[in-house]
Interface confidence: low
């Protein structure tokens, strides 16, 4: 004799207000003899939803004819769904007894829920920029979804992140829920072009997860490296000195030249180029006049990047006798 199984195939049933919901329940055996009843909830406070033999259940109809002798389908339809109908529904087999029937076996239950889509995830990064090798936090929020079960994942450039903490509120029963997650991301020097993505999957989205993004360019500061060099050739009485400011982000940069401690006001030629990784290079050329009576010259290239403390590089100008005597023009 086959042991009776109560099959409720859906763990979750999404319903819409005003529509009809079908709750499936099939049994695998006709034995033991006795009725199948439907309840919402468990324990002594459970609510009777349908009893074929007695009671009045105007909104409930059966899918199959329960009077048929070999009927094994005890599925029901509940019409005109309202928010008050949400909960977990169980089909329960009773064994015929005297004076009362005895509960024999319950199905695993089907949760009936009013579905509500989560809002588009909003990702917020840190308030201030941080340099590479440091950790920054990003938060992701989505609201207004139901049922409570939801999955949230974080990605950086398509690679899943594991260092994050997620909370779904409220913890108890509610019409709608919110999710908030905070991910910790270690910045790499090449992250100017990187993105973090918060991805939310929910039953109402049916496999088309919602995504929120944030650009790491908003969170990262890549400090520049400086190099000051003297060009070997000169133009007439002038020597060309170059200050190369490499690999910085964001673009905001102030560069000043000083000659023996005195800030030079005159204009200098410069170029800005963008690297493949999104960082920038800045090159500034400074022409220094050289003459016989001139002492040694110390040039300083000072850079203030993105409101940070200034960094500088110095160069003691080497003016050889040969250079001083040379009168012909040379192109650098």
């Amino acid at each position: 004799e086959e042991e009776l199984q109560m099959i409720q195939p859906e763990k979750l049933l999404l319903v819409t207000v005003g529509k009809t919901a079908t709750l499936h329940c099939t049994v695998t055996s006709l034995l033991p003899v006795g009725p199948v009843l439907w309840f919402r909830g468990v324990g002594p406070g459970r609510e009777l939803i349908y009893n074929q033999k007695e009671g009045h259940f105007p909104r409930v109809t059966t899918v199959s004819d329960l009077t048929k002798r070999n009927n094994m389908d005890f599925s029901i339809r509940i019409s005109s769904i309202t928010p008050a109908d949400v909960g977990t529904y169980y089909c329960v087999k009773f064994r015929k007894g005297s004076p009362e029937n005895v509960e024999f076996k319950s199905g695993p239950g089907t949760e009936m829920a009013l579905g509500a889509k989560p809002s588009a995830p909003v990702v917020l990064g840190p308030a201030a920029r941080t340099t590479p090798e440091h950790t920054v936090s990003f938060t992701c929020e989505s609201h207004g979804f139901s049922p409570r079960d939801i999955t949230l994942k974080w990605f950086k450039n398509g690679n899943e992140l594991s260092d994050f903490q997620t909370n779904v509120d409220p913890t108890g029963q509610s019409v709608a829920y919110s999710i908030r997650s905070t991910a910790r991301v270690v910045l790499d020097p090449w992250d100017v072009r990187s993105q973090v993505i918060c991805e939310v999957a929910h039953v109402t989205l049916q496999g088309d997860p919602l995504r929120g993004t944030a650009n790491l360019s908003e969170a990262i500061r890549v400090p520049p490296t400086l190099e000051v060099t003297q060009q070997p050739m000169r133009v007439g009485n002038q020597v060309n000195v170059t200050c190369q400011v490499r690999k910085f982000y964001p673009q905001s940069l102030q560069l000043t030249w000083s000659e023996n401690g005195n800030v030079c006001q005159r204009e200098t030629a410069s170029t800005l180029t963008e690297n493949k990784d999104g960082t920038y290079n800045w090159t500034s050329w400074f022409l220094v006049n050289i003459s016989d009576q001139r002492d040694d010259v110390v040039l300083t290239c000072q850079v203030k990047h993105d409101g940070q403390l200034a960094v500088s590089k110095r160069l003691a100008l080497e003016v050889t006798v040969h250079q001083k005597d040379q009168s012909s023009d040379a192109t650098p």
């Epitope: 579905g115 889509k117 991805e199 999957a201 109402t204 496999g207 997860p209």
Partner: antibody, heavy 120, light 107 residues
Framework: QIQLVQSGPELKKPGETVNISCMAS????????MNWVKQAPGKGLKWMGW????????TYADDFKGRFAFSLETSASTAYLQINNLKNEDMATYFC?????????????WGQGTLVTVSA | DIVMTQSHKFMSTSVGDRVNITCKAS??????VAWYQLKPGQSPKLLIY???IRHTGVPDRFTGSGSGTDYTLTISSVQAEHLALYYC?????????FGGGTKLEIK
Amino acid sequence: QIQLVQSGPELKKPGETVNISCMASGYSFTNYGMNWVKQAPGKGLKWMGWINTYTGEPTYADDFKGRFAFSLETSASTAYLQINNLKNEDMATYFCARQPYDYVPSFPYWGQGTLVTVSA
Amino acid sequence: DIVMTQSHKFMSTSVGDRVNITCKASQDVSTAVAWYQLKPGQSPKLLIYWASIRHTGVPDRFTGSGSGTDYTLTISSVQAEHLALYYCQQHYSTPWTFGGGTKLEIK
């Protein structure tokens, strides 16, 4: 068990309209999206788009915007594909495929396919 | 759109052989690749998803591998019933796209 049963083959003339149905059973219809996939003779599979069976929102791939329409009859657990103003290049087998709602937009459950023949 | 390229339209093999069916994505799809078997007159059958996870009930002679842009479906011991078309599909971003298919023929 989960089943997707599609309507039978169709023979149509260019310019006519065809309706293909996909009836689902064995699961809660409104819990899972329904995708449509085209296979033209001698060609590969092409995703046409999908319809959210809970909200009724359709999403169409770029090549299937305009003459193609996805719809639902939720009470009958049925999804529909309608192709208007049929052209010769619409001659193909059309599959419906159920969408899981996790992170795996691959398709474990398919209808048997509906062959649409377009001939003057 | 992400283009999935199956460079071999046909592959000929013998019963008992090991065969590798390859698929190349036009960009990194982070292992979001599925493989399907399609026999004449039937609907596609899901074999593999997430590049290497076997779908329920799929025999272990089917294995998937790969990362980045390059993916492979391996049939360790080909049987006559494996004569079919095999498609890869990316499930990384919409629109979901399939490869052109590889027809496995038995010598």
